[in-house]
């Protein structure tokens, strides 16, 4: 039951994540105008990753697309390619996670195959996160170094009295957005790696094991404990050993040829 | 059709102060901003202050201290307030609707003579 | 505050004569967001409110004939009338209207030879 809600926790706290990646990415507010002290402004303007709009004091808005790709910042490029690609890996995962998850019944889908899906969409929205979080970070930076450098050109001097005034950029709604969304993403991964671990059958689940001595004598099989996963071939609670440890219950088999050395 | 006409006293004594109103018809003070300007006899255009559609006031900083603008949706008017005249206040006084977009001033009134003298 | 400078004071023209104005600003008018100049050019005559010609440095308002035409970027501006007519001769004011508070130049004044 907790394992349910793990799962399914991390899953619409992924999807919660992940609209917002894709919010974030498609918004025009990634920077904005500081305002210093002009709180009105005749002209407002702000951008985002695909295009630039000004506002004015009358409310009209104006936006226009970066018709090129050469003439970017390659920072912006990259930014822009870590968003895509937390979106893509975000909907791989959610794509994933959808037949992963435990009240969903798919055919006569093993709970072995649930935990491998659930486990690497897990994995897949912890880089989706990371990469929304990295792509916003490195634009939030890009934001801080420009602002200072236009803050100490803040007038620059065009012979004698004409003057230009650099405008400077801070953070956009777009940033918090990604960031939350990063982060909300990235915690769904957590939980959904966590619901693995309940989610992959109990392969150590041993009853008490007596041994027997042999005339002959045993080797144990290699590869005899295995890591409970759930990436393994044992769907079922099978030995593990087919040597001389025999559980108490158990009817004394005869040793097989592959028990001898 | 779009109108603005301002009504004011015509006549204000040196330190008094000075109200003019300024009723618009045909569009609405919440779709669209309205400034103030002024001209002084022989004198160019001076812009005073502006009231968006948003309900933000601008106004110019030299004069701040001494005006304010308010606005009566219902009556469709804007009320200009300016204290402390003097006689280099004397103007023609002008309400000019905010251009949807381009920061213009697309529509004007005819003006209101105001002069201050004692 | 931003200041604008016009040039000339005034201008004495025949009917038919191409005339231009011009009028600088102490800071650049240019927006790169949408690459538009926040300049915007008047027309007053004598006992009538001022007329909207230009806006955005070079976009004739509707109505405003096109011999005016107006040009420029940054911080240097042009007004031009092809073809001076009677109708014309009155005082051009550009203004800034990038920066508030929104600042007028002292006008350029066409008057009959």
């Known amino acids: 039951m907790a394992v349910t809600a793990c799962q399914g926790l991390g899953f619409v706290v992924s999807l919660i994540g992940i609209a917002g990646i894709i919010a974030a990415t498609c918004m025009d507010q990634w920077s904005t105008q500081d305002l210093y002290n002009n709180p009105v402004t005749a002209v407002f303007n702000y951008q985002g990753l695909w295009r630039s709009c000004v506002r004015e004091s009358s409310g009209f808005t104006e936006c226009r697309g970066y018709f090129t790709l050469l003439g970017l910042p390659a920072m912006l490029q990259a930014v822009r390619a870590l968003m895509i690609v937390g979106i893509v890996l975000g909907a791989i995962g959610l794509l994933v996670s959808i037949f992963a998850l435990k009240c969903i019944r798919i055919g006569s889908m093993e709970d072995s195959a649930k935990a491998n899906m659930t486990l690497t969409s897990g994995i897949m929205f912890i880089v989706s996160g990371l990469c929304a979080i990295a792509g916003v970070s490195v634009f939030a930076n890009m934001l801080v170094t420009n602002f200072w450098m236009s803050t100490a050109n803040m007038y620059t001097g065009m012979g004698g009295m004409v003057q230009t005034v650099q405008t400077r950029y801070t953070f956009g709604a777009a940033l918090f957005v990604g960031w939350v969304a990063g982060g909300l993403t990235l915690i769904g991964g957590v939980m959904m790696c966590i619901a693995c671990r309940g989610l992959a059958p109990e392969e150590t689940n041993y009853k008490a094991v007596s041994y027997h001595a042999s005339g002959h004598s045993v080797a144990y099989k290699p590869g005899g404990f295995k890591a409970s996963t759930g990436f393994g071939s044992n769907t079922k609670n099978k030995k593990i050993y087919d040597g001389g440890a025999r559980t108490e219950d158990e009817v004394q088999s005869y040793p097989s040829k592959h028990d001898y050395v | 059709q779009v109108q603005l006409k301002e009504s004011g006293p015509g006549l204000v004594a040196p330190s008094q102060s000075l109200s003019i109103t300024c009723t618009i018809s045909?569009?609405?003070?919440?779709?669209?901003?309205v400034h103030w300007v002024r001209q002084p006899p022989g004198k160019g255009l001076e812009w005073l202050v502006v009231?968006?559609?948003?309900?933000?006031?601008v106004y110019n900083s030299s004069l701040k201290s001494r005006l304010s603008l308010t606005k009566d949706n219902s009556k469709s008017q804007l009320l200009l307030k300016m204290n402390s005249l003097q006689t280099d206040d004397t103007a023609i006084y002008y309400c000019?609707?905010?251009?949807?977009?381009?920061?213009?001033?697309?529509?004007w009134g005819q003006g209101t003579s105001v002069t201050v003298s004692s | 505050d931003i200041v604008m400078t016009q040039s000339p004071s005034s201008l004495t023209v025949t009917a038919g004569e191409k005339v231009t104005m011009t009028c600088k600003s102490s800071q650049s008018l240019f927006n790169s967001g949408n690459q538009r100049n926040y300049l915007t050019w008047y027309q007053r005559k004598p006992g009538q409110p001022p007329k909207l010609l230009i806006y955005w440095a070079s976009t004739r308002e509707s109505g405003v004939p096109d011999r005016f035409t107006g040009s420029g970027s940054g911080t240097y501006f042009t007004l031009t009338v092809s073809s001076v007519q009677a109708e014309d001769l009155a005082v051009y004011y550009c203004?800034?209207?990038?920066?508030?508070?929104?600042?007028f130049g002292s006008g350029t004044k066409l008057e009959k030879k």
């Open positions: 000019a609707r905010h251009k949807a977009y381009g920061n213009a001033m697309d529509y």
């Open positions: 045909g569009f609405s003070l919440n779709t669209y901003g």
């Open positions: 009231m968006l559609s948003d309900g933000n006031t």
């Open positions: 203004q800034n209207a990038y920066y508030f508070p929104f600042t």
